[in-house]
Interface confidence: low
């Protein structure tokens, strides 16, 4: 999906009002310095691409993020503010239902959510132009 035409300010508002708090809740009990940010993004469409990938694509050691509160709110924000996004996700959602596993918060998931926090922060503050 090409995130270029999303309403970035509305997505930012959704992040600030709810998603950020849900991410913090998920990470509660974890030191902010425990994980190093290894994933970054260069502009808002790129950030959303990385956010979608880390939130909804199962990875080795962490298959359960898609059903977390922050993930469902992320999906809702993208569906509302990114034209055509929801249509592209129907097949992916059906596939996800088939392979849903018991919810376990692993250290790998915590690390992944820490990366997500960094991506959202970068999305939330577009870089200044270099002068």
């Amino acid at each position: 999906y090409d995130f270029t035409n999303c309403d970035f300010e509305k997505i930012k508002a959704a992040y600030l009002s709810t998603i950020s708090k849900d991410l913090i809740t998920y990470m509660s009990g974890t030191k902010s310095t425990e994980f190093n940010n290894t994933v970054s993004c260069s502009n808002r469409p790129h950030c959303l691409t990385e956010i979608q990938s880390l939130t909804f694509n199962p990875t080795a050691g962490c298959a359960s993020l898609a059903k977390e509160m922050f993930a469902m709110k992320t999906k809702a924000a993208l569906a509302i503010w990114c034209p055509g996004y929801s249509e592209t996700q129907i097949n992916a959602t059906q596939a996800m239902k088939k392979r849903r596993k018991r919810k376990v918060t692993t250290n790998k998931c915590l690390e992944q959510v820490s990366q997500l926090q960094g991506l959202w922060r970068r999305f939330n503050r577009p870089l200044l132009k270099q002068q």
Partner: antibody, heavy 121, light 105 residues
């Protein structure tokens, strides 16, 4: 714990330049913006400019008309503010202030201790 | 550039009294931040984004407002609250108000 430690006081002559440093610790330096704010004796706070340590992008208060240059050294987690063509009215305390992204409006949540710059002939 | 005007310049009150500080913007802004500064010290964040208390700030401090008019309220002044208070906005440039000094009457 987030800490911003600034360089020591400076005394300069009119027409000279001064370069103030601000060493950051306790967070990922490239994640946040860094502002420079000054305060002349008995005066209001005055924003000078800002840098994104991530890519070196800057924005300046036009009042300083090219006299201010803000840079950073990511390997040292340090931001710098250089002010040239100094005049007596530049006598002030200069602060660096981290600008946090977790609040809409990008608030300055941690400040350095301040560096006093005195311009006198 | 958005100009912030704070009033009054000086507020003389006694401990236990209520303090109401005003900040008016020359054009509409989305939110306002508030800082406290004591002599010889760096500013300390009090209120983020109009009404959110900064970490470690007691609940007697509160913020409100919208558009061009914003208010910082201290419900009951404690001895440590006597200081100068600045409002600040973010637009293309960050700007600060001229400050309100809260002094002991």
């Amino acid at each position: 714990e987030v800490q911003l430690v600034q360089s020591g006081a400076e005394v300069k002559k009119p027409g000279a330049s001064v370069k103030v440093s601000c060493k950051a610790s306790g967070y990922t330096f490239t994640d946040d913006y860094m502002n420079w704010v000054r305060q002349a004796p008995g005066q209001r706070l005055e924003w000078m400019g800002i840098i994104s340590p991530y890519n070196g992008g800057t924005s300046y208060n036009q009042k300083f008309k090219g006299r201010v240059t803000i840079t950073r050294d990511t390997s040292a987690s340090t931001a710098y503010m250089e002010l040239s063509s100094l005049r007596s009215e530049d006598t002030a305390v200069y602060y660096c202030a981290r600008e946090d992204y977790d609040y809409d409006g990008y608030a300055m949540d941690h400040w350095g201790q301040g560096t006093t710059v005195t311009v006198s002939s | 550039e958005i100009v912030l005007t704070q009033s009054p310049a000086t507020l003389s009150l006694s401990p236990g009294e209520r303090a109401t500080l005003s900040c008016r913007a020359s054009s509409s802004v989305s939110y306002m931040h508030w800082y406290q500064q004591k002599p010889g010290q760096a500013p300390r964040p009090l209120i983020y984004a109009t009404s959110n208390l900064a970490s470690g700030i007691p609940a007697r401090f509160s913020g409100s407002g919208s558009g061009t008019d914003y208010t910082l309220t201290i419900s009951r002044l404690e001895p440590e609250d006597f200081a100068v208070y600045y409002c600040q906005q973010w637009s293309s440039n960050r700007t600060f108000g001229g400050g309100t000094k809260v002094e002991i009457k």
